[in-house]
Amino acid sequence: MMTGTIETTGNISAEKGGSIILQCHLSSTTAQVTQVNWEQQDQLLAICNADLGWHISPSFKDRVAPGPGLGLTLQSLTVNDTGEYFCIYHTYPDGTYTGRIFLEVLESSVAEHGARFQIP
């Protein structure tokens, strides 16, 4: 039975040209995290594998940095970066947990961070 929950940074906004940290945290389970995938819609951004470390997809190497922790930093944001981002935790023996973050990249300087919330 999957007992874990993923806490994410929720709905967030950031300024064009700036950077943002996408964060997820898996709690309430003793399952071992074997790999975390970061995806944007159907595109793989990055992988953090427990044995091998990080791998950033070649097309994102210039604008994506690993960390902090299992999070992901997006840099040089453009309006096209607006959309859904997913952290996918591969665990043993539980299976897969997925967290969702919605990022809005704003032209103006009124970007504010949304509240944190939990996805069961």
Partner: antibody
Framework: EVQLVESGGGLVQPGGSLRLSCAAS????????MNWVRQAPGKGLEWVSY???????HYADSVKGRFTISRDNAKNSLYLQMNSLRAEDTAVYYC???????????????WGQGTMVTVSS | DIVMTQSPDSLAVSLGERATINCKSS????????????LAWYQQKPGQPPKLLIY???TRESGVPDRFSGSGSGTDFTLTISSLQAEDVAVYYC????????FGGGTKVEIK
């Protein structure tokens, strides 16, 4: 004794195929993440491929789409199917086990003796 | 990919003397969430596979003599052999695994 023994190397023409095997003894391969690492003659080490205990698979960019890693837990063996071989694939191929622990060290603690693959016409 | 640069390429040291090998990574290999440096050291003798000496930059693998020690953090690391023995003649490699694994070019240690 914990041991890894590779086999299947040899001389193959460019564009050809080979299947390497790695037989494990002294431990159960299914409980560990396993890797292939290669070393070109007189050169350094290059990680090639990985398969976890839960069958997550990764490849180095240099072999992606040409090499396939697999394992047979019943035979306690690891395999590397190598297709579309190139001269630059010439190397000693080692199978290597990821060190296990409460917190992953991400280091290779057990290595086989290696098998030589030569790609030449 | 992280590039690992070892220096020197080769090193000749008298028996019983100290040998120091340096390894520099092009990016930090320190993982902030557990404060561990994902840096390992291997010894490879002629005709043999590599042997793990050190992981997490400074943790000695079981059975490795205590004359081998590792130090450093972030991007700069050192392997020290405090008193070189004849059986230590080998090539030594550093390896990072903050990103998918890459190895340094190796340092050949010989007896002067």
């Amino acid at each position: 004794e914990v041991q890894l023994v590779e086999s299947g190397g040899g001389l193959v023409q460019p564009g050809g195929s080979l299947r390497l095997s790695c037989a494990a003894s002294g431990f159960t391969i299914g409980g560990y993440s396993m890797n292939w690492v290669r070393q070109a003659p007189g050169k350094g080490l290059e990680w090639v491929s990985y398969i976890s205990s839960s069958s997550t698979i990764h490849y180095a960019d240099s072999v992606k789409g040409r090499f396939t890693i697999s394992r047979d837990n019943a035979k306690n063996s690891l395999y590397l199917q190598m297709n579309s071989l190139r001269a630059e694939d010439t190397a000693v191929y080692y199978c290597a086990r990821h060190r296990i622990g409460r917190s992953p060290s991400r280091a290779f603690d057990i290595w086989g003796q290696g098998t030589m693959v030569t790609v030449s016409s | 990919d992280i590039v690992m640069t070892q220096s020197p390429d080769s090193l000749a040291v008298s028996l019983g003397e100290r040998a120091t090998i340096n390894c520099k990574s092009s990016q930090s290999v320190l993982f902030s969430s557990n404060n561990k440096n994902y840096l390992a050291w291997y010894q490879q003798k002629p005709g043999q596979p590599p042997k793990l000496l050190i992981y997490w930059a400074s943790t000695r693998e079981s059975g490795v003599p205590d004359r081998f020690s590792g130090s450093g953090s972030g991007t700069d690391f050192t392997l020290t052999i405090s008193s070189l023995q004849a059986e230590d003649v080998a090539v030594y490699y550093c390896q990072q695994s903050y990103f998918f694994p890459t190895f340094g070019g190796g340092t050949k240690v010989e007896i002067k």
